[in-house]
């Protein structure tokens, strides 16, 4: 009865501080409304990074000020986190909740370790 959530173990952010990963869930029921939350776990403390609720078949929309964007296709969500710095390196957990119709289900992935390396400042060059 548990809902399984899969996500990659490791992702490397690009030089612009953007990291993308897929969160896939095996739905035990026919959900029409799904909520996806990205959590960051550091030193056993868990905080919310971003969250979005979407209707199956519709687009995933995060709040305007969110650092996340995403698209959904069936039971798969493609998540992108922007504006990451080296200090944001950590474990990012995908949580999926099947909100409607009942019964409610929750699934939690094992987490994606996102590594962020701040770019080296460009050296002064003489032209």
């Amino acid at each position: 009865k548990a809902m399984h959530v899969a996500q990659p173990a490791v992702v490397l952010a690009n030089s612009r501080g953007t990291a993308s990963f897929v969160c896939e869930y095996a739905s035990p029921g026919k959900a029409t409304e799904v909520r996806v939350t990205v959590l960051r776990q550091a030193d056993s403390q868990v905080t919310e990074v971003c969250a979005a609720t979407y209707m199956m078949g519709n687009e995933l929309t995060f709040l305007d000020d969110s650092i996340c964007t995403g698209t959904s296709s069936g039971n798969q969500v493609n998540l992108t986190i922007q504006g990451l710095r080296a200090m944001d390196t950590g474990l990012y957990i995908c949580k999926v909740e099947l909100m409607y119709p009942p019964p409610y289900y929750m699934g939690i992935g094992n987490g994606t370790q996102i590594y962020v390396i701040d770019p080296e400042p460009c050296p002064d060059s003489d032209f």
Partner: antibody, heavy 118, light 108 residues
Framework: QVQLVESGGGVVQPGRSLRLSCAAS????????MHWVRQAPGKGLEWVTF????????HYADSVKGRFTVSRDNSKNTLYLQMNSLRAEDTAIYYC???????????WGQGTLVTVSS | EIVLTQSPGTLSLSPGERATLSCRAS???????LAWYQQKPGQAPRLLIY???SRATGIPDRFSGSGSGTDFTLTISRLEPEDFAVYYC?????????FGQGTKVEIK
């Protein structure tokens, strides 16, 4: 710090109504789903109802379905439980509880006692 | 509905002893979604363990949880006077959310 404070309990006759409130503070209320859990005198814990972040989705225990209604006002950081057609078996301490990020009920109120008696 | 059955109903032990509490589910529960709570008389329940084995904030390390599938265990390695209370297991992966009937740990 996180605080949940229930109010509205009391003695009520069978068939009557009562509304419980749970005032939340110390956290961003709208970012959490919430629950009501009850405990009859000398008995164990029984989950009553769940409400989603924005209040659009609600789930109820079979024992209260059709009689109880959960709601929330995120602008007032308050959770409510409207209890109609009360029965003697609804006599219990009612707790509101917050769902933690990973799912368990991480904070509970002190509870409010509802006694249904003629 | 997932039914949780706790055993024993009452555990009579002395301070310093080890307590082992059992919680059995009627069907498989993901270990990510099994919690243990402690409740003392006149108080609200307090979260001890979540995800079957992770201690909640501020919970001393004498409390530990283990198990998977349908069998879960809460262990208190050395009972302190403040540990005598009622303990409940709970599954929270799907609705309806369910609790075990509780195990009372009392002073022998």
């Amino acid at each position: 710090q996180v605080q949940l404070v229930e109010s509205g309990g009391g003695v009520v006759q069978p068939g009557r109504s009562l509304r419980l409130s749970c005032a939340a503070s110390g956290f961003t209320f709208s970012s959490y789903t919430m629950h009501w859990v009850r405990q009859a005198p000398g008995k164990g814990l029984e989950w009553v109802t769940f409400i989603s972040y924005d209040g659009s989705n609600k789930h109820y225990a079979d024992s209260v379905k059709g009689r109880f209604t959960v709601s929330r006002d995120n602008s007032k950081n308050t959770l409510y439980l409207q209890m109609n057609s009360l029965r003697a078996e609804d006599t219990a301490i009612y707790y509101c509880a917050r769902t933690g990020w990973l799912g368990p009920f991480d904070y509970w109120g002190q509870g409010t006692l509802v006694t249904v008696s003629s | 509905e997932i039914v949780l059955t706790q055993s024993p109903g009452t555990l009579s032990l002395s301070p310093g002893e080890r307590a082992t509490l059992s919680c059995r589910a009627s069907q498989s529960v993901s270990s990510s979604f099994l919690a243990w709570y402690q409740q003392k008389p006149g108080q609200a329940p307090r979260l001890l363990i979540y995800g079957a084995s992770s201690r909640a904030t501020g919970i001393p390390d004498r409390f530990s949880g283990s198990g998977s599938g349908t069998d879960f265990t809460l262990t208190i390695s050395r009972l302190e006077p403040e540990d005598f209370a009622v303990y409940y297991c709970q599954q929270y992966g799907s609705s309806p959310w369910t609790f075990g009937q509780g195990t009372k740990v009392e002073i022998k």
